[in-house]
């Protein structure tokens, strides 16, 4: 109508998807009677009647709003439930009397997108790519209106940069009317980006104001050529023979190049390639002194066939040679003296110690052991230990046996053995002396002899217990060039009352045991012969 004032801006009503919008008809009493109002929705400039108010009573018109509209506030407010993005439009109320006026409401609909889902390029990014590559994608699902995306690297927003950074965003409309935003970050990365943290942020608005959601932080696999190659040895510190040693080749490129490890040959002055495991690690197990030498690593880029060489690394496997003792098999008369000398070579300074074998008692610190006024008891083992004090566990030993000339010496002079008649008895007798003695028995039986060491012998005799044997006992006699000696074994019948409850079975064993190394005892075992019938 000419001269009519411009339409005022519609009232803004903001609401979240799924909630209820309250559309209050803002007509004053002078502009129209609120008991007689028509409500319209305006879409693409087309008005559609959606609701009528007559005498304060509401009536929905058939159509998309039929089930979702109701009157509130004594007819002044139209309530629209279950708001969807499609409801974002202008609604107007029109009073009928005294003259037709209308009031417009702009409904704005909002929905927060879901948490952004960030995906990293699963193949990684080479630094030498000619163009920006797809680094990561960010997807924000089911937001309304379309959220804004910002990409961050190490906490700083990324800006478009020609030929360096390109952000490509697109959106799709779901059947619900909500938007799914996909943003692709394309960039040319550099080696330093291997540790960079990327994330995306979705900015969106709700009736309550501006909000944002952040994705998780991700790192991107970055591929870059090797510039430096080096060797690492494990364990660190001083190495010794017997250790498990790993020589590992390392490079600063990603992916790691193909490695080969070589060792300088001192005689030919040429490097010889060593056999590494699948990971390019040379394992020396056990390490030997021959493994000492100069090692180098060569790294190959299989694409370019360019190779890089590491700084050489000197490897020293510390060792102690076999220990030599002189004299190697000493023999001495009682009362004489003896000097034992120990020698060994090592890659480090050595310490020597002499120990008595039987007691582990330290006799001397140094390579020479002097023994004077030798007694028979001085016979036996002496151990020289050559060790490197600066490398725990690096030592070698050599045992030498000293023989003192003398007649046989019995482990025991006499002893009692408990027996039962008709048992097979296992008797033992031990003697020592130099020269090594032989042992004989005064009764018939099966005898067997075994060397305990060069000066000591153990004889065992299997014999049937008879009344005569119980009468006489058993003697063993040891003899050598320098004399003879005898031990007596007295046989005593077992009193049945001394037997334990479970030892009266037909297969029971009764054993009397003592260490053959102690000078007072020996071992005897009796075994009952199988009987023709068992006793109940």
């Amino acid at each position: 109508v000419p001269g009519e004032a411009e339409q005022p801006a519609p009232e803004l009503v903001e609401v979240e998807v799924g909630s209820t919008a309250l559309l209050k008809c803002g007509l004053s009493q002078s502009q129209g009677n609120l008991s007689h109002v028509d409500w319209f929705s305006v879409h693409k400039e087309k008005r559609t009647l959606i609701f009528r108010v007559r005498q304060g009573q509401g009536q929905s018109e058939p159509g998309e709003y039929e089930q979702r509209l109701s009157l509130q506030d004594r007819g002044a407010t139209l309530a629209l439930t279950q708001v969807t993005p499609q409801d974002e439009r202008i609604f107007l109320c029109q009073g009928k009397r005294p003259r037709s006026q209308e009031y417009r409401i702009q409904l704005r609909v909002y929905k927060a997108p879901e948490e952004p889902n960030i995906q990293v390029n699963p193949l990684g990014i080479p630094v030498n790519s000619k163009e920006p590559e797809e680094v990561a994608t960010c997807v924000g699902r089911n937001g309304y209106p379309i959220p804004q995306v910002i990409w961050y690297k190490n906490g700083r927003p990324l800006k478009e940069e020609k030929n360096r950074v390109h952000i490509q965003s697109s959106q799709t409309v779901e059947s619900s009317g909500l938007y799914t935003l996909q943003s692709i970050l394309k960039a040319q990365l550099v080696k330093e980006d291997k540790d960079a943290q990327f994330y995306c942020e979705l900015n969106y608005r709700l009736p309550s104001g501006n909000h944002m959601k952040e994705s998780r932080e991700v790192t991107v696999p970055v591929f870059y050529p090797t510039e430096k190659v080096w060797l690492e040895v494990e364990p660190v510190g001083m190495l010794k023979e017997g250790d498990r040693v790993e020589i590992r080749c390392l490079a600063d490129g990603n992916p790691p190049p193909h490695f080969s490890i070589s060792k300088g040959n001192p005689s030919t002055r040429e490097a010889e390639e060593e056999t590494t495991n699948d990971n390019g690690v040379l394992v020396l197990e056990p390490a030997r002194k021959e493994h000492s030498g100069r090692y180098e690593c060569q790294a190959w880029n299989l694409d370019t066939m360019i190779s890089l060489l590491s700084e050489p690394q000197e490897l020293l496997v510390n060792y102690v040679s076999d220990v030599r003792v002189s004299p190697a098999a000493p023999e001495r008369q009682e009362g004489s003296s003896l000097t034992l000398t120990c020698e060994a070579e090592s890659s480090q300074d050595l310490e020597f110690q002499w120990l008595r074998e039987e007691t582990d008692q330290v006799l001397e610190r140094g390579p020479v052991l002097q023994l004077h006024d030798l007694k028979r008891e001085a016979g036996g083992g002496y151990r020289c230990v050559a060790s490197v004090p600066s490398i725990p566990g690096l030592n070698r030993t050599q045992l030498v046996k000293l023989a003192i000339f003398g007649p046989p010496w019995m482990a025991f002079k006499e002893r009692k053995v408990w027996v039962k008649e008709n048992m097979v008895l296992n008797l033992s007798c031990e003697a020592s002396g130099h020269p090594r003695p032989t042992i004989s028995w005064n009764v018939n039986g099966t005898a067997s002899e075994g060397d305990q060491d060069p000066q000591r012998v153990l004889s065992t005799l299997n014999v049937l217990v008879t009344p005569e044997l119980l009468e006489t006992g058993v003697e063993c006699t040891a003899s050598n060039d320098l004399g003879k000696n005898t031990s007596i074994l007295f046989l005593e019948l077992v009193n049945l009352t001394t037997l334990t409850p479970d030892s009266n079975t037909t297969t029971g064993l009764s054993t009397s045991t003592a260490s053959p190394h102690t000078r007072a005892n020996s071992t005897s075992t009796e075994r009952k012969l199988p009987e023709p019938e068992s006793r109940g």
């Epitope: 889902n117 995906q119 990293v120 390029n121 699963p122 193949l123 990014i125 080479p126 790519s129 000619k130 163009e131 920006p132 590559e133 797809e134 994608t137 997807v139 692709i184 998780r216 696999p221």
Partner: antibody, heavy 116, light 106 residues
């Protein structure tokens, strides 16, 4: 619409080199990466190699020394060569488009038999 | 390399049944998982990407769920045309496929 079509020999002899071509339409090789995937008869799918929209190449480490992937953007073609073929390489070979990291369109596949 | 283990390797169900296929990753792959359908003698067809997003044109009876290492493909009401082998694929680090699940009608 988006299409991918594989072409190449159906039969190769052991130790020979296989060359397969994937011709694409409906998108640009400078916008999307393309992968090669194979499937031996009655078995599962196995990724072989890819070339990115920027031209970077990637290979399955199991075959890396035998593979080369390249592209000719003017012809909209991606080429895969696989050396030293073996009867175990008998499979249907597919090319597939990345969108951007998953495979949304596949070629119809070409069955390659390795036999003497 | 990331391994993807699918179970079961095969199943038989009646038309209208709800069918569930699982896929387990050897490490956390977040939501970098796709599901493909391959009918006998045909090309693999993308059903689901980003673990739970339905590819355009795929019937809504297909749905995907899961995150991290455990994922599920569900067919809410099995149809005769769903007879196929289904593969999961991770794209978190490189590309690896599951061994496949063959779905048949009883």
């Amino acid at each position: 619409q988006v299409t991918l079509k594989e072409s190449g020999p159906v039969l190769v002899k052991p130790t020979e080199t296989l060359t397969l071509t994937c011709t694409v339409s409906g998108f640009s090789l400078t916008s999307n990466a393309v992968s090669w995937v194979r499937q031996p008869p009655g078995k599962a799918l196995e990724w072989i190699a890819a070339i990115s929209s920027g031209g970077s190449t990637y290979y399955n480490s199991a075959f890396k020394s035998r593979l080369t992937i390249s592209r000719d953007t003017s012809k909209s073609q991606v080429v895969l060569t696989m050396t030293n073929m073996d009867p175990v390489d008998t499979a249907t070979y597919y090319c597939a488009r990345h969108r951007p990291f998953y495979f949304d369109y596949w070629g119809q596949g070409t069955l390659v038999t390795v036999s003497s | 390399d990331i391994q993807m283990t699918q179970s079961p390797s095969s199943l038989s169900a009646s038309v209208g049944d709800r069918v569930t296929i699982t896929c387990k990753g050897s490490q956390n792959i977040y939501k970098s998982l796709a599901w493909f359908q391959q009918k006998p003698g045909k090309v693999p067809k993308l059903l689901i990407y980003d673990a739970n997003s339905l590819q355009t044109g795929i019937p809504s009876r297909f749905s995907g769920s899961g995150s991290g290492t455990d994922f599920t493909l569900t067919i809410s009401s099995l149809q005769p045309e769903d007879v196929a082998t289904y593969y999961c694929q991770q794209y978190y680090s490189g590309y690896t496929f599951g061994g496949g699940t063959k779905v048949e009608i009883k």
